[in-house]
């Protein structure tokens, strides 16, 4: 919520150090609550760096004040079950952007460490931590990724319809009737099959789907040269401007697209979101995650970060675990079980790597002689006579559509249906009115049409 000088702690300083504009980054590190491992320094439960980073503009002589922090969440994905007890480490890093006092620099301003006890699914917990002359106000919570539920996120929820104590719109889980499915945090109406969210009220689309609620299939076509399919009958369109167009990375940095934004891989000696920061030395503490800084005694000589296991990047800023290669397809969640990896698939997908699309004809056959028909990015079964339902597993009720006209009674039969017609009507569907004078039967007029309307009998 805010970061700044604590009350009554000597001469108040500003996080920007009165050196002009600066940015604050927050690195969150989760460790096991009780760790017997020698790898005490590793963030074994997970780590993340803040991404919503505004520039704070401040000038020498201004009175110091706490800086309001942006609302952007710092999401730390944790692997396996949530332990409940954990150590929370929050580092506050300053990136100085001004030209005063030697130019840009990175500094670790504060590092707060504390043991916490927290069940997943609970409300936000507020906290204030002081370290040295700094004070950090923040909130934190633990949340399970569906379909995991429970205080430890260790149970997988298969929702079922049944009377329960669950809140409105939430259903109990099979086989844990006392557990309720996790409430949806996505934008209302976001497609559960083709959309997902990482933050409340957003809706991100899986490959092949688009639209604000991910309900519009992206039409495929034979467009060549990486052109994208255009609207019907317009051929192909050139892709719109991408985040890397014009290469926003300075100083020889290489740009890669990451979910609608971009990421710069900076050459040694440069840092910042666009590799715009230079002249960094080891004294500025540029190596994250316990990386060892070597060289770089002065701004002209490049430093090198030697990263601890599990981290890479020119500043050890990227966590590299065995899930980094993204083995799970179609938005599946990768879990490292120690001896191997496993994928937790999103709804509508199955297989060890979530590679089978259950909404795809290749994924599952239609029963009882039904045929699978694909279209619009989904599949449906066209069922044989006498069968119905999504997979043609249900015996169809031939009388459900009330096929017998004029009050005729319908009887289901092994070969279809039989109509017992009301007096004065005849035909397979009781569609003919019987003339009392013995003349030929004529189709009975539907209600609202006169018997003699010519357009009815052309």
């Amino acid at each position: 919520h805010s970061f700044g000088p604590g009350p009554g702690l000597g001469t108040p300083r500003s996080p920007c150090n009165a050196r002009g504009p600066c940015r604050l980054f927050f690195r969150v590190c989760l460790k096991p609550g009780v760790s017997q491992e020698a790898t005490e320094s590793l963030c074994a439960l997970g780590a993340a760096l803040s991404t919503s980073v505004p520039v704070y503009t401040e000038h020498p002589g201004e009175s110091a004040a706490a800086l309001p922090l942006p609302d952007g969440l710092v999401r730390v994905p944790f692997r396996d079950a949530w332990p409940g007890t954990f150590s929370l480490v929050i580092e506050t890093w300053r990136e100085q952007l001004g030209e005063h006092a030697g130019g840009p620099a990175w500094n670790l301003l504060a590092r707060v460490v504390g043991r916490r006890r927290l069940a997943a699914g609970g409300p936000w917990a507020r906290d204030v931590q002081r370290t040295g002359t700094w004070e950090l106000h923040f909130s934190y919570r633990a949340r399970c990724e569906p379909p995991a539920v429970g205080a430890a996120c260790a149970r997988l929820c298969r929702s079922r319809s049944a009377p329960s104590r669950c809140g409105p719109g939430l259903r109990p889980c099979t086989p844990f009737p006392d557990e309720c499915e996790a409430p949806s945090v996505c934008r209302p109406g976001c497609s559960p099959e083709h959309g997902y969210c990482e933050e409340p009220d957003e809706c991100r689309c899986l490959e092949g789907w688009t639209g604000p609620l991910c309900t519009v299939p992206v039409s495929t076509s034979s467009c060549l040269n990486s052109r994208v399919p255009g609207p019907a009958s317009t051929g192909c369109l050139l892709p719109g401007p991408g985040p890397c167009d014009g290469n926003p990375c300075a100083n020889g940095g290489s740009c890669s697209e990451t979910s609608g934004s971009f990421e710069c891989a900076c050459p040694r000696g440069f840092y910042g979101l666009r590799c715009e920061v230079s002249g960094v030395t080891c004294a500025d503490g540029p190596c994250f995650n316990g990386g060892l800084c070597v060289g770089g005694e002065d701004p002209d000589s490049a430093y090198v970060c030697h990263c601890p296991p599990g981290f890479q990047g020119s500043n050890c800023e990227k966590r590299v675990d065995r899930c980094s290669l993204q083995p799970c397809q179609n938005g599946g969640l990768c879990l490292d079980l120690g001896h191997a990896l496993r994928c937790r698939c999103r709804a509508g997908f199955a297989g060890p790597r979530c590679e089978h699309d259950l909404d795809d004809c290749a994924g599952r056959a239609c029963a009882n002689g039904g045929t699978c028909v694909e279209g619009g990015g989904s599949r449906r079964c066209s069922c044989a006579l006498g069968f119905g339902g999504r997979d043609c597993r249900e015996r169809a009720d031939p009388c459900a559509s009330r096929p017998c006209a004029h009050g005729g009674r319908c009887y289901a039969h092994f070969s279809g249906l039989v109509c017992a017609c009301a007096p004065g009507y005849m035909g397979v569907r009781c569609e003919f009115a019987v003339r009392p004078d013995g003349a030929d039967a004529v189709p009975a007029a539907p209600r609202g049409l006169r018997q003699a309307d010519p357009q009815r009998f052309l």
Partner: antibody, heavy 120, light 107 residues
Framework: EVQLVQSGSELKKPGASVKVSCKAS????????MNWVRQAPGQGLEWMGI????????IYNHKFKGRFALSVDKSSNTAYLQISSLKAEDTAVYYC?????????????WGQGTTVTVSS | DIQMTQSPSSLSASVGDRVTITCHAS??????MGWLQQKPGKAPKGLIY???NLEEGVPSRFSGSGSGADYTLTISSLQPEDFADYYC?????????FGGGTKVEIK
């Protein structure tokens, strides 16, 4: 039958580039990562990097960052290793080796190796 | 990076001998390691995965054991075709690393 067939030997001059291919058959290409391993003459094995053919995501040994690039062509079930600005010390046998993407197995099948000689 | 220290670097043995090669990791790797065999001029071949599981088609005289940071490859009765170089490899963490190798020679 699972097979990884690599391209033939290459003789290159320093500063040139080389692209080594590894064609996979007998299994679902996108279900297995492809590792690349280097063996200099008379030396042991050195892991260079790994690529997920499904997503194209790569991870490199920091020793092999910069001049070395891994890629795949899913349509032909082929993985590639490209080395640019060749140096004499790049002279080695380069192997591709598949690995189950859920890490249930180690590097079970290997290509026959491609000898790259860099000499002026 | 995880260091894999393999010993011995070479050994001489006779047909029928029991041979043991060890590999020590610089930190625990939870069984995420394998053993490879390489004959002169040939590509390596997988023998053992997950510390103790035999790859398909590998004779049962080969066995692997160990946990934590220490692992062993045993050849219960050495055969003429077993004279080769043997390597351990860890895949617990990137970058993967190999042991220095053990050359098994005829006595």
């Amino acid at each position: 039958e699972v097979q990884l067939v690599q391209s033939g030997s290459e003789l290159k001059k320093p500063g040139a580039s080389v692209k080594v291919s590894c064609k996979a058959s007998g299994y679902t290409f996108t279900d297995y990562y492809m590792n690349w391993v280097r063996q200099a003459p008379g030396q042991g094995l050195e892991w260079m990097g790994i690529i997920n053919p499904y997503s194209g995501v790569t991870i490199y040994n920091h020793k092999f960052k910069g001049r070395f690039a891994l890629s795949v062509d899913k349509s032909s079930n082929t993985a590639y290793l490209q080395i640019s600005s060749l140096k004499a010390e790049d002279t080695a046998v380069y192997y591709c080796a598949r690995q189950d993407s859920l890490l249930d197995y180690a590097m079970d099948y290997w290509g026959q190796g491609t000898t790259v000689t860099v000499s002026s | 990076d995880i260091q894999m220290t393999q010993s011995p670097s070479s050994l001489s043995a006779s047909v029928g001998d029991r041979v043991t090669i060890t590999c020590h990791a610089s930190q625990g790797i939870s069984g995420n390691m394998g053993w490879l065999q390489q004959k002169p001029g040939k590509a390596p071949k997988g023998l053992i995965y997950h510390g103790a599981n035999l790859e398909e088609g590998v004779p049962s005289r080969f066995s692997g054991s160990g946990s934590g940071a220490d692992y062993t490859l045993t050849i219960s009765s050495l055969q003429p075709e077993d004279f080769a170089d043997y390597y351990c490899v860890q895949y617990a963490q990137f970058p993967y690393t190999f042991g220095g190798g053990t050359k098994v020679e005829i006595k």
